[in-house]
Interface confidence: low
């Protein structure tokens, strides 16, 4: 025997109190799939959250973070305070990156500068709190008579951790 509720489309719920009639979701609620026996309460974007997409009868609201904060987690479940480039967020607030580390974003942690010597390269541009070092040709490549066909290795793309 087919469940009559399966005929109820998204945006409605199957009202068992009314002979399984499909009733529209009440205000501030939604059902994103058919055959639902209840509608879900819409997410409310309050406090540090701001609304990116309004709730509709068939889809939940989507939130962003207010200025000075950024999203964390799936579907922006949390907002975390921004820091400046060259800083990371600790339990005590934003702190400057320690020497030898950098952060080129307003979020995330300070990461160690690339160790150019591991790749047999030399440091072409020194690192700062905000930027990674740029590795250049190895010292051997710079010796007189050495071929200079190898271009300097580019700096890593901002925001990407080394693989």
């Amino acid at each position: 025997l087919q469940d009559l509720c399966s005929n109820c489309p998204a945006g409605t719920f199957c009202d068992n109190n009314r002979s399984q009639i499909c009733s529209p979701c009440p205000p501030n609620s939604f059902s994103s799939a058919g055959g639902q026996r209840t509608c879900d309460i819409c997410r409310q974007c309050k406090g540090v959250f701001k609304t990116r997409k309004e709730c509709s009868s068939t889809s939940n609201a989507e939130c962003d973070c207010i200025s000075g904060y950024h999203c964390l987690g799936a579907e922006c479940s949390m907002c975390e305070q921004d820091c400046k480039q060259g800083q990371e967020l600790t339990k005590k607030g934003c702190k400057d990156c320690c020497f030898g580390t950098f952060n080129d974003q307003k979020r995330g942690i300070c990461r160690p500068w690339t160790n150019c010597s591991l790749d047999g390269k030399s440091v072409l541009v020194n690192g700062t709190k905000e930027r990674d070092v740029v590795c250049g040709p190895s010292p051997a490549d710079l010796s007189p008579g050495a071929s200079s066909a190898t271009p300097p290795a580019p700096a890593r793309e901002p925001g990407h951790s080394p693989q």
């Epitope: 489309p9 994103s32 058919g34 997409k53």
Partner: antibody, heavy 119, light 107 residues
């Protein structure tokens, strides 16, 4: 059953824009996001962007923001992706795929359209 | 963007073998990891979502595990139809990103 139907192949001249289609059936079209994914020959998969047919809200991968435009026609349950000024770099298989909400997986895929950009 | 790395691009195995395919994310993706199978004809199917949940109709010889940044897909008792390419994909953050794929070949 759920189906996402795509033409098997499209040929376009370099520079002439092209519009790929994806016809959905077997489910409520307005309740699922439609995504587009690119695959160059012998390469991996790249997410281009998605559109929510209910209100045409879109998200784009920054890499494709100036290349792809996503639209839907609710009356025919069809999603479209227009590629502007195609070059040989745009020659690839393009898949449409759907997901339900935020972090859901892509649970159904079209067969893919092989786009060839050639003069 | 979150980078997804499948360090093994191809893998050879025999019928009946048990194989594990790994995938690493460049940051914690809180279990929002999905696995897809692509057949040589281009057909793509969802196998596993949210790290370990089997999609409907997928045989139980497929399983997934992992947490944080490291995830894996295991296929036990390999069958002929399992020789294909497998992709991981994160659903944690936009843009959604895929691993480069692991092609499973018959030995």
């Amino acid at each position: 059953q759920v189906q996402l139907q795509q033409p098997g192949a499209e040929l376009v001249r370099p520079g002439a824009s092209v519009k790929l289609s994806c016809k959905a059936s077997g489910y409520i079209f307005t309740s699922y996001w439609i995504n587009w994914v690119k695959q160059r020959p012998g390469q991996g998969l790249e997410w281009i962007g998605n559109i929510y047919p209910s209100d045409s809200y879109t998200n784009y991968n920054q890499k494709f923001k100036d290349k792809a435009t996503l639209t839907v026609d609710k009356s025919s349950s069809t999603a479209y992706m227009q590629l502007s000024s195609p070059t040989s770099e745009d020659s690839a298989v393009y898949y449409c795929t759907r997901f339900h909400y935020g972090s859901s997986p892509f649970d159904n895929w079209g067969q893919g359209t092989t786009l060839t950009v050639s003069s | 963007d979150i980078q997804m790395t499948q360090s093994t691009s191809s893998l050879s195995a025999s019928l009946g073998d048990r194989v594990t395919i790994s995938c690493r994310a460049s940051q914690d993706i809180s279990h929002y990891l999905n696995w897809y199978q692509q057949k040589p004809d281009g057909t793509v199917k969802l196998l596993i979502y949210y790290t370990s949940r089997l999609h409907s109709g997928v045989p139980s010889r497929f399983s997934g595990s992992g947490s944080g940044t490291d995830y894996s897909l295991t296929i036990s008792n390999l069958e002929q139809e399992d020789f294909a390419t497998y992709f991981c994909q994160q659903g944690h953050t936009l843009p959604r990103t895929f691993g480069g794929g692991t092609k499973l070949e018959i030995k």
